[in-house]
Interface confidence: low
């Protein structure tokens, strides 16, 4: 058959790759490679990722685990999912807050901070979007309020003075 070894790994199962001299079984997710196998088709020596580190995929070459990120409380971030040996911490914003990217071209790994969603109700406006950033994202004035300048003003309840059109239900009947 000649003296050259086939570069293909003729081992049972497909999770083998050539590491050093032999085809070795890789390490499962959450483990790093301590030492390659010492016989063909053997098992590599794999150690579990230490605390605060992870490896998300099966691998044949990672001799270290990646550091888990910590969510930045000063940026109002919270951990949506805690770090485990097989997955990084997933940082995000708590309900009622939205992600504001710190760089102009935002990708999933970009640094970010959390901003509170605008409370349209506190502005006496309908909530048009799930999370509004500006008051212009809010809807029209709530019943009992009318547009005046930039805001919503409570409809007059007295019979004195005029009754704005939007307030007919509140003060119109008294006119």
């Amino acid at each position: 058959q000649g003296g050259t070894r086939s570069p293909r790994c003729d081992c049972a199962g497909d999770f083998h790759k050539k590491i050093g001299l032999f085809c070795c079984r890789g390490c499962p997710a959450g483990h790093y490679l301590k030492a390659p196998c010492t016989e063909p088709c053997g098992n590599s020596t794999c150690l579990v990722c230490p605390q605060d580190t992870f490896l998300a995929w099966e691998n044949h070459h990672n001799s270290e685990c990646a550091r888990c990120q910590a969510c930045d409380e000063q940026a109002s971030q919270v951990a949506l999912e805690n770090c485990s040996a097989v997955a990084d911490t997933r940082c995000g914003c708590k309900p009622g807050w939205f992600v504001e990217c710190q760089v102009s071209q935002c990708v999933s790994s970009s640094p970010f901070y959390c901003q509170p969603c605008l409370d349209c109700g506190a502005l006496h406006r309908h909530t048009r979007l799930l999370c509004s950033r500006r008051d212009t994202d809010c809807g029209t004035c709530l019943p009992g309020f009318y547009e005046h300048g930039d805001g919503c003003v409570s409809c007059p309840t007295s019979t004195l003075g005029s009754c704005p059109e939007r307030c007919a239900a509140v003060c119109g009947w008294r006119q």
Partner: antibody
């Protein structure tokens, strides 16, 4: 306001020990990885040691491995560097530096003002 | 051991501009680096991180006069409209993990003199 305040430096003889402390305030201490970095007089910066947020990962520069020990007390917002068997080449200003960690990038974003360690006979 | 190379000095005229270079050794060629400013007898101050694609993010209070760019194994820090307070030593640094050891390497620093 983020603050890191080092203490414990001073004059020591070769072979002796010192313990440096770094007291932190203005941020959630337990969320952040921390480092010690030193600077010999008139020289550049030299990384000394690293400790992860929950002390699960610790690393040392070759020059101090086996002599220095980094540790932290998250309950007291404090970082420590125990320095044993001091040598004259350990003479430097020692800074503690915070790693923001959450960015997924390595970056020492806040530094203390430093504490001076002088090793001389 | 990874190496970051910086030229020892650079000068800039007041209101002029200056561009500092940090060259990464092959092990670090794709790495993000960080620029630090150190004024005499002060602690280093975080200026910005700078990725291999040139994207960067500045630290708090760093003026718009400071910008970063990248080309291959080179990382640049540019200062335009140079002011007297920019007179300082600028270090580049990179965090890395090698053989299951985490560490930092720093360049030797570039002393910027404002004329």
């Amino acid at each position: 306001e983020v603050q890191l305040v080092e203490s414990g430096g001073g004059l020591s003889q070769p072979g002796n020990s010192l313990q440096l402390s770094c007291e932190a305030s203005g941020f959630t201490f337990s969320n952040h990885d921390l480092n010690w970095v030193r600077q010999a007089p008139g020289k550049g910066l030299e990384w000394v040691a690293y400790i992860s947020s929950a002390s699960g990962l610790i690393s040392y520069a070759d020059a101090v491995r086996g002599r220095f020990t980094i540790s932290r007390d998250n309950a007291k917002n404090s970082l420590f560097l125990q320095m044993n068997n001091l040598k004259s080449e350990d003479t430097a200003m020692y800074y503690c530096a915070r790693d923001p960690a959450y960015t997924g990038l390595y970056a020492l974003d806040f530094w203390g003002q430093g504490t001076q360690v002088t090793v001389s006979s | 051991q990874p190496v970051l190379t910086q030229s020892p000095s650079a000068s800039a005229s007041l209101s002029g501009s200056v561009k500092l270079t940090c060259t990464l050794s092959s092990e670090l060629s794709g790495f993000t680096i960080v620029w630090y400013q150190q004024r005499p007898d002060k602690a280093p101050k975080y200026v910005m991180y700078l990725k291999s694609d040139g994207s960067h993010s500045k630290g708090d209070g760093i003026p718009d006069r400071f910008s970063g760019s990248s080309s291959g194994a080179h990382r640049y820090l540019s200062i335009s409209n140079v002011q007297s307070e920019d007179d300082a030593t600028y270090f580049c640094g990179a965090g890395y993990t090698l053989a299951n050891q985490y560490g930092w390497v720093f360049g030797s620093g570039t002393k910027v003199t404002v004329l």
